[in-house]
């Protein structure tokens, strides 16, 4: 069993939906648009890809979740916050931020109106 | 113990209706996505139909698009699969299969299989 | 619709020997989305690798995935008698989640 359950509490709250959903599909679907023709992402070769793949499944899991804006927001911060320490500049973490603003509407919902996407600190 | 049980197959006549049931048992079953999976008689697996933790998100394989809905009931642990205008072609084994995926690296596989009931379209 | 091709359709090997499987798609797959099953006659089929080079749980290390784009290999490096069987790839990252035809691995 590889699953890590949710935590305990109101069974609604978006921190428990954020937790049962796979959010690796979203992220590595904005660091194929971002890293494009690059090396390696996470073991798992994203050259020569199809990006659909990971936006189907990424598309799939947001849409298990209450489509309200908080729910959307901390999805969105968490995906951010997984990423972070595999983003090696600025320019990298600015990309990363706007694909991942882009992504509720990639997947036809609605995007959250404010999201604060600076995570870990302020490290990004 | 993990545990999945599909019950509902037999004999049905060409363009005839029949409902697949999969019992699951030992785990959270409103935690997982759903698959139907078919094998014809000496032939390979062929994927049949999915559903999401939460019913949001169905797909169909194309050869059963418009005859066949899957659906779930989470508070019964159940999930079904309605089968209608039935075909010979549909004559197979229906395997019931949950899905997971690996936490820490994303990757989905189906890791729990029914052993599977038997269709038979014939006349 | 992505199509899985095996090959060879039929290998036949003896005890002891390496075995080595193909998948090929007729599109890319992420290599996150491709897994491999054995099944044996009369029984479901069994969770052996996804992510195209994860074991799952249970499997023997003699059992190794590779590959990436549109070219997967599983491998069984030292064949043991209860390895005979039919292998498949799947495919589910792009609905629909379609499964090779499959691999008959015999005995010699």
């Known amino acids: 069993m590889r699953r890590e359950r949710g935590r305990q509490g109101d069974s609604s709250s978006c921190e428990r939906q954020v937790d049962r959903v796979n959010l690796k599909p979203c992220e590595q679907h904005i660091m194929q648009r971002i890293m494009g023709e690059q090396e390696q992402y996470d073991s798992y070769d994203i050259r020569s890809t199809r990006s659909s793949d990971q936006q189907q499944r990424c598309c799939d899991e947001l849409n298990e979740m209450e489509n309200t804006q908080r729910c959307m927001c901390e999805a969105l911060q968490q995906i951010m916050e997984n990423q972070c320490d595999r983003l090696q500049d600025r320019q990298m973490v600015q990309q990363f931020k706007r694909e991942l603003m882009n992504l509720p509407q990639q997947c036809n919902f609605r995007a959250p109106q404010r999201c604060d996407l600076d995570v870990s600190g302020g490290r990004c | 113990e993990v545990q999945l049980v599909e019950s509902g197959g037999g004999l049905v006549q060409p363009g005839g209706s029949l409902r697949l049931s999969c019992a699951a048992s030992?785990?959270?079953?409103?935690?997982?996505?759903m698959n139907w999976v078919r094998q014809a008689p000496g032939k390979g697996l062929e994927w049949v139909s999915s559903i999401t933790r939460s019913s949001r998100t169905i797909y169909y394989a194309d050869s059963v698009k418009g005859r066949f809905t899957i659906s779930r009931d989470n508070a019964k642990n159940s999930l079904y699969l309605q089968m209608n205008s039935l075909r010979d072609e549909d004559t197979a084994v229906y395997y019931c299969?949950?899905?997971?995926?690996?936490?820490?690296?994303?990757?989905?596989?189906?890791?729990?299989w029914g052993k599977g009931t038997t269709v038979t379209v014939s006349s | 619709e992505i199509v899985l091709t095996q090959s060879p359709g039929t290998l036949s090997l003896s005890p002891g020997e390496r075995a080595t499987l193909s998948c090929r798609a007729s599109q890319s797959v992420s290599n996150m989305f491709l897994v491999w099953y054995q099944q044996k006659p009369g029984q479901a089929p069994r969770l052996l690798m996804y992510?195209?080079?994860t074991r799952a749980t249970g499997i023997p290390d003699r059992f190794s995935g590779s590959g990436s784009g549109t070219d997967f290999t599983l491998t069984i490096s030292r064949l043991e008698p209860e390895d005979f069987a039919v292998y498949y790839c799947?495919?589910?990252?792009?609905?629909?989640?379609?499964f090779g035809q499959g691999t008959k691995l015999e005995i010699k």
């Open positions: 299969a949950r899905e997971d995926f690996d936490v820490s690296t994303g990757p989905y596989y189906m890791d729990v």
């Open positions: 030992g785990f959270i079953f409103s935690d997982y996505n």
């Open positions: 992510g195209a080079s």
């Open positions: 799947q495919q589910n990252g792009n609905s629909p989640y379609t």
